[in-house]
Interface confidence: medium
């Protein structure tokens, strides 16, 4: 059962999960002036049995440079905060990892692979929180949360964590040295399908006269 | 002249910036089957129907939470109903909208 | 480009009848296949996604199987209401394609 929304944003903190349960997704995304291969996977899917968990399909990224219908943008504001925010964190490994059942490792990255990593949770998925560089966590419980089924419906459980503007960093369980982390969201963000019951789509249609006609794709 | 066919799709009861889905375009002529033509991240990336490419343009309005389709040089073989929907990429498209009937004659 | 082989094209039922549809895919496509569901003049309803996971607010008479290139949409007790045209599709690569449609009606 996908989680219906994001992990609970906690200020001047990231999240992190470990582990990824089965039925985790992640999309294939390519860095801009590169494109997934043509036929190439929309994402990878974390699979397996009760022994062996891994992540089936294989994202590949080739360049769009070739395309004369390409055209460079420069990202509004927002894409910009948004890139900034989600730079690619070397892979945090705890060392018993492997070992959890149902649970896919980080996927190794890909050439050419976007900055920003967006997983598709799954009910029983846990996160870890914490404090980005320059900032110190208070705990009055734990710095994580789960994914859970209540009544039919996906909540994530709230963090017990403060962050503090002192120069210190704290850590993510199984870390040996502390990880500097860029505000805002990691690359593990992810926006699950929010619920369907209140959401709409209207369309308009307006047919124009063009003399002149060009395509541009954002790639 | 050519004709240049223009579409937009009002998102409601969500925003069309967050991410963890794209928003498509799809098109049925009368009496036939379905038949994707493109969607957009809520970043701007695009993929396209290679039958289509050469004339689709998806584009996203994130202050006016809506995205759009510009289909240009228009036949009667682009008579058909299309539909915008939220695509949840392996979860299926779950949120569609009504549909719009374009009829396109010589 | 993936094609996906729906049959039959058409079908006749009665109410109360179990009712299966398949769909084939030119390759091996894991569980990335989505079931839907449509009626005169309206949007297509999303039934079943990954190939077996029943979407939110759809009857339980309604189930999806199968992986890799075979997958199956199985109407059990079919109901009034359930003479529609069905469409699988798959969203394992781009371009995404879907079935030709499976239209249902009453015996």
């Known amino acids: 059962e996908l989680c219906d929304d994001d992990p609970p944003e906690i200020p001047h903190a990231t999240f992190k999960a470990m582990a990824y349960k089965e039925g985790t997704m992640l999309n294939c995304e390519c860095k801009r002036g590169f494109r997934r291969i043509k036929s190439g996977s929309l994402y990878m899917l974390c699979t397996g049995n009760s022994s062996h968990s891994s992540w089936d399909n294989q994202c590949q990224c080739t360049s769009s440079a070739t395309r004369n219908t390409t055209k460079q943008v420069t990202p509004q504001p927002e894409e910009q905060k948004e890139r900034k925010t989600t730079e690619m964190q070397s892979p945090m490994q705890p060392v018993d990892q492997a070992s959890l059942p149902g649970h896919c490792r980080e996927p190794p990255p890909w050439e050419n692979e976007a900055t920003e990593r967006i997983y598709h949770f799954v009910v029983g998925q846990m996160v870890y929180y914490q404090c980005v560089q320059g900032y110190r966590a208070l705990h009055r419980g734990p710095a994580e949360s789960v994914c859970k089924m209540t009544h039919g419906k996906t909540r994530w459980t709230q963090p017990q964590l403060i962050c503090t503007g002192e120069m210190e960093t704290s850590q993510f369980p199984g870390e040996e040295k502390p990880q500097a982390s860029p505000e805002g969201r990691p690359e593990s963000e992810t926006s699950c399908l929010v619920t369907t019951t209140d959401f709409q789509i209207q369309t308009e249609m307006a047919a124009t006269m063009e003399t002149s006609i060009f395509t541009t794709e954002y790639q | 002249p050519s004709q240049t066919l223009s579409l937009t799709c009002a998102v409601s009861g969500g925003s069309i910036s967050s991410g963890g889905y794209s928003w498509s375009w799809i098109r049925q002529p009368p009496g036939k089957g379905l038949e994707w033509i493109g969607y957009i991240y809520h970043s701007g990336s695009t993929y396209y129907n290679p039958s289509l490419k050469s004339r689709v343009t998806i584009s996203v309005d994130r202050s006016k939470n809506q995205f759009s389709l510009k289909l240009s040089s228009v036949t009667a073989a682009d008579t058909a109903v299309y539909y915008c929907?939220?695509?949840?990429?392996?979860?299926?498209?779950?949120?569609w909208g009504q549909g719009t009937t374009v009829t396109v004659s010589s | 480009d993936i094609v996906m082989t729906q049959t039959p094209s058409s079908l006749s039922a009665s109410v109360g009848d179990r009712v299966a549809i398949t769909c084939q895919a030119s390759?091996?496509?894991?569980?990335?296949v989505n079931w839907y569901q449509q009626k005169p003049g309206e949007a297509p309803r999303l039934l079943i996604y990954?190939?077996?996971t029943l979407q939110r607010g759809v009857p339980s008479r309604f189930s999806g199987s199968g992986s890799g290139t075979g997958f199956t949409l199985t109407i059990n007790s079919l109901q009034p209401e359930d003479f529609a045209t069905y469409f699988c599709?798959?969203?394992?690569?781009?371009?995404?394609?879907f079935g030709g449609g499976t239209r249902v009606d009453i015996k």
């Open positions: 599709q798959q969203s394992h690569s781009t371009p995404i394609t």
């Open positions: 390759r091996n496509i894991w569980s990335y």
């Open positions: 929907a939220r695509a949840g990429y392996y979860y299926g498209m779950d949120v």
């Open positions: 990954g190939a077996s």
